[in-house]
Interface confidence: medium
């Protein structure tokens, strides 16, 4: 984050940004930036694998929900979108693309279909869905 | 926008940002930044006047919808929230807090109640509502 203090000292007061304001990012052009994470909603429908590939091609991953506080903008998302959560049949757990396990109490998992992938829906709900079904999707890029 | 080129030259290549990435803002801390506009969703319910006052106290205004392209993140907003659109009885038009008139084809206005204020809902819909009814609200700050 480019804090106001840093920018003001850097530019010798030429950039007048209130101390409570800050820059967010960096993010890919025209993505949403929130609490230094980048998000983009894609409204062309793809299956889970194609959605994952699309995010990867943009140096991002499918949405990972890791914090209700840091990601509270997700509360108000309308409709259903692929996220990066997949079912691991061998141990029955749900895990993210990066291999981390879904933390308890983060998502309410709802069995909508028999499947191994999950759609994100408002208020931190995850809907189980067949991975080959086309849906819109959310890509996410965590800034360093 | 702090472009990658500018930042790279400023910091002598220490900050490695892809050329397609950029910073967004500045925005108030923890607000959503998108296409260099700042947004925040407030989930305490207030009437229109209180909502307006809350936004103003944060150096912002209630949501103004001015472009479907620049504000396409609003397509996916769930629920109903006060925006800065009010009915002007003298000429029957709807205008924003800044005095500008609602452009045609930006919002589909829907008769929900008799009133002089409007709630924003997903897919660029505006719902007529009595200004004294408490609702959640969206504040917006346009960056220069």
């Amino acid at each position: 984050i480019w804090s106001a203090v840093f920018l003001n000292s850097l530019f010798n007061q030429e950039v007048q940004i209130p101390l409570t304001e800050s820059y967010c990012g960096p993010c890919p052009k025209n993505w949403i930036c929130y609490k230094n994470n980048c998000y983009q909603f894609f409204n062309e429908s793809k299956n889970w694998y194609e959605s994952q590939a699309s995010c990867m091609s943009q140096n991002a991953s499918l949405l990972k929900v890791y914090s209700k506080e840091d990601q509270d903008l997700l509360k108000l998302v309308k409709s259903y979108h692929w996220m990066g959560l997949v079912h691991i049949p061998t141990n029955g757990s749900w895990q993210w693309e990066d291999g981390s396990i879904l933390s308890p109490n983060l998502l309410t998992i709802i069995e909508m279909q028999k499947g191994d992938c999950a759609l994100y829906a408002s208020s931190f709900k995850g809907y189980i869905e067949n991975c080959s079904i086309p849906n819109t999707y959310i890509c996410m890029q965590r800034t360093v | 926008i702090w472009s990658a080129v500018f930042l790279n030259s400023l910091f002598n290549q220490e900050v490695q940002i892809p050329l397609t990435e950029s910073y967004c803002g500045p925005c108030p801390k923890n607000w959503i930044c998108y296409k260099n506009n700042c947004y925040q969703f407030f989930n305490e319910s207030k009437n229109w006047y209180e909502s307006q006052a809350s936004c103003m106290s944060q150096n912002a205004s209630l949501l103004k919808v001015y472009s479907k392209e620049d504000q396409d993140l609003l397509k996916l907003v769930k629920s109903y929230h006060w925006m800065g659109l009010v009915h002007i009885p003298t000429n029957g038009s709807w205008q924003w807090e800044d005095g500008s008139i609602l452009s045609p084809n930006l919002l589909t206005i829907i008769e929900m109640q008799k009133g002089d204020c409007a709630l924003y809902a997903s897919s660029f819909k505006g719902y007529i509502e009595n200004c004294s009814i408490p609702n959640t609200y969206i504040c917006m700050q346009r960056t220069v």
Partner: antibody
Amino acid sequence: QVQLQQSGTEVKKPGASVKVSCKASGYTFTTYGLTWIRQAPGQGLEWMGWISVFNGSPNYSLKFQGRVTMTADTFTNTAYMELRSLRSDDTAVYYCARGGTGDYYPLFDYWGQGTLVTVSS
Amino acid sequence: AIRMTQSPSSLSASVGDRVTITCRASQGIRNDLGWYQQKPGKAPKLLIFAASNLESGVPSRFSGSRFGTDFTLTISSLQPEDFATYYCLQDYNYPYTFGQGTKLEIK
């Protein structure tokens, strides 16, 4: 083009109920309210109330409160007005009209052709 | 309820005449008033909304104006098809109320 097509003439006995329908076409039904207005023979127009088709919420004139029910079926794009405990002075042509509040759209810019309800013993 | 007092209740005029019909509201109603034309056996037709706005497709000889709580419908040059009954309607608050009507007849 916008059309509101109402159901046909009704003859009812005092104390009975009548349900008039109004089928909308040519526009997005849920965007506009739907109002009911009546006109007794040789008399002026009387506003009965309107329903927000979007959320099904009605606003009735106090005169008809308790006797009238306005509903809207968004699957068939049809609005209904039911009037109960009919009296002879309910004999009138009943109109549906597009619009509910007049706060954005011109109020009552399209009307049904009217349904004559005669209450007679 | 807001009372809308419409005058005159009837009016005889000739083709080409300028005609004025007035509605007075019993309290302030902003610009929340419309004018409607009704011919025998037909549904009313919207002419003017929000006091002075001409509905699309309505001839420009019709106009509306407001002065305080007095609202006026003016027909600048009467045409044969204008002979009908005219009503005002307030939609400022519930219950919406119509004026009692003005019957415009051929002299």
